[in-house]
């Protein structure tokens, strides 16, 4: 079945801007003019999850990449890592549950609750150019909140 | 104040074009998904279709191919551009905002703009 | 995805308690939101998700419902709540689509 998608940036909540670091990993760090052009174009795809009031699953590939962010245990630990995907079968509307975030949208901010560890979050650091990971807190030190914003 | 206003409504005859307009205030249209929804004289609610980015633009069946949704981000400006009209597309044409990306429902309507195609 | 209001047409006096339900083709899991519209007026969004009431909905209002079958419940009609309701699926791959309204009028 076909699949509502959109591309768009994501920047966290102290606008840091989020680009590639290595072929698999993303990092977060502050960029202006030109170096903007650096930033990861994701894919944004509405997907089927489990029933929830507030709660929106999506899966976020990488433009032109057959590459989407999912939830592992490594070592016992939740975390997040960017997988290569056949692209002739993604996106699809019921994808693995690995690959399915839980979007939370309040007053134009958004959070990425991993579907397959509840209460786990794609997170930042506060410090400057540190991989983009999956936090067990909200609210804390590390920042779980990002703006979206639409790419042509 | 956030509101929508359409503009663009009017009288034309079947075959004909109409570009229909609705502009965003006291929000940004590059985060939000904005749609189109009609409803004809004394009938119910249909929905036209819907924009995210200018490269992903989702529409009813029956729509595809006449009508077209853009959107111009420096305008705050969404539009609908209607081609090879005919009587049954007289309508009121509302523009709306999802109330949150992909949640498919809309929470924030314009007044809406008449279409009125005869001859 | 065909959505389907009962009644068309559903006449009540003020204080009554109110049902309207609307049957999906195929199940949507949750992904149901209710419509109030009044003449010449846009729609307003009353509940979303099937349960959740928009904000500044009075608590009179209620969804309910999960998979094809779904009820919008007003528990004590008041003298505003006359108008056309309308279900919505919203969650249906990349199509939308309403229900055919439910016109809400005075009895007598």
């Known amino acids: 079945a076909p699949v509502r998608s959109l591309h768009c940036t994501l920047r966290d909540a102290q606008l840091k801007s989020l680009v590639m670091s290595g072929p698999y990993e993303l990092k977060a760090l502050h960029l202006q003019g030109q170096d903007l052009e650096q930033q990861v174009v994701f894919s944004m795809s509405f997907v089927q999850g489990e029933e929830s009031n507030d709660k929106i699953p999506v899966a976020l590939g990488l433009k032109a990449k057959n590459l989407y962010l999912s939830c592992v245990l490594k070592d016992d630990k939740p975390t997040l890592q960017l997988e290569s995907v056949d692209p002739k079968n993604y996106p699809k509307k019921k994808m693995e549950k690995r690959f399915v975030f839980n979007k939370i949208e309040i007053n134009n901010k958004l959070e990425f609750e991993s579907a397959q560890f509840p209460n786990w979050y794609i997170s930042t650091s506060q410090a400057e150019s540190m991989p983009v990971f999956l936090g067990g807190t909200r609210g804390g030190q590390d920042i779980t909140d990002f703006t979206m914003q639409f790419v042509s | 104040e956030v509101q929508l206003v359409e503009s663009g409504g009017g009288l034309v005859q079947p075959g004909g074009s109409l570009r229909l307009s609705c502009t965003a205030s006291?929000?940004?249209?590059?985060?939000?998904?904005m749609a189109w929804v009609r409803q004809a004289p004394g009938k119910g609610l249909e929905w036209v279709g819907i924009?995210?980015?200018?490269?992903?633009?989702y529409y009813a069946s029956w729509a595809k191919g006449r009508f077209t949704i853009s959107r111009d981000t420096s305008k705050n400006t969404v539009y609908l551009q209607m081609n090879s009209l005919r009587a049954e597309d007289t309508a009121v044409y509302y523009c709306?905002?999802?109330?949150?990306?992909?949640?498919?429902?809309?929470?924030?309507w314009g007044q809406g703009t008449l279409v009125t195609v005869s001859s | 995805i065909v959505m389907t209001q009962s009644p068309s047409t559903l006449s009540a006096s003020v204080g009554d308690r109110v049902i309207i339900t609307c049957q999906a083709s195929?199940?949507?899991?949750?992904?149901l939101s209710w419509y109030q519209q009044k003449p010449g007026k846009a729609p307003k969004l009353l509940i979303y998700?099937?349960?959740t009431l928009a904000s500044g909905v009075p608590s009179r209002f209620s969804g309910s419902g999960s998979g094809a079958e779904f009820t919008l419940t007003i528990s004590s009609l008041q003298p505003d709540d006359f108008a056309t309701y309308y279900c919505?699926?919203?969650?249906?791959?990349?199509?939308?689509?309403f229900g055919q309204g439910t016109k809400l009028t005075v009895l007598g």
């Open positions: 006291g929000f940004s249209l590059s985060s939000a998904a």
């Open positions: 709306a905002r999802e109330r949150a990306i992909f949640s498919g429902d809309f929470v924030l």
């Open positions: 924009i995210y980015d200018s490269a992903s633009t």
């Open positions: 998700r099937a349960s």
């Open positions: 919505q699926n919203t969650g249906g791959g990349v199509s939308i689509a």
């Open positions: 195929q199940s949507i899991d949750n992904w």
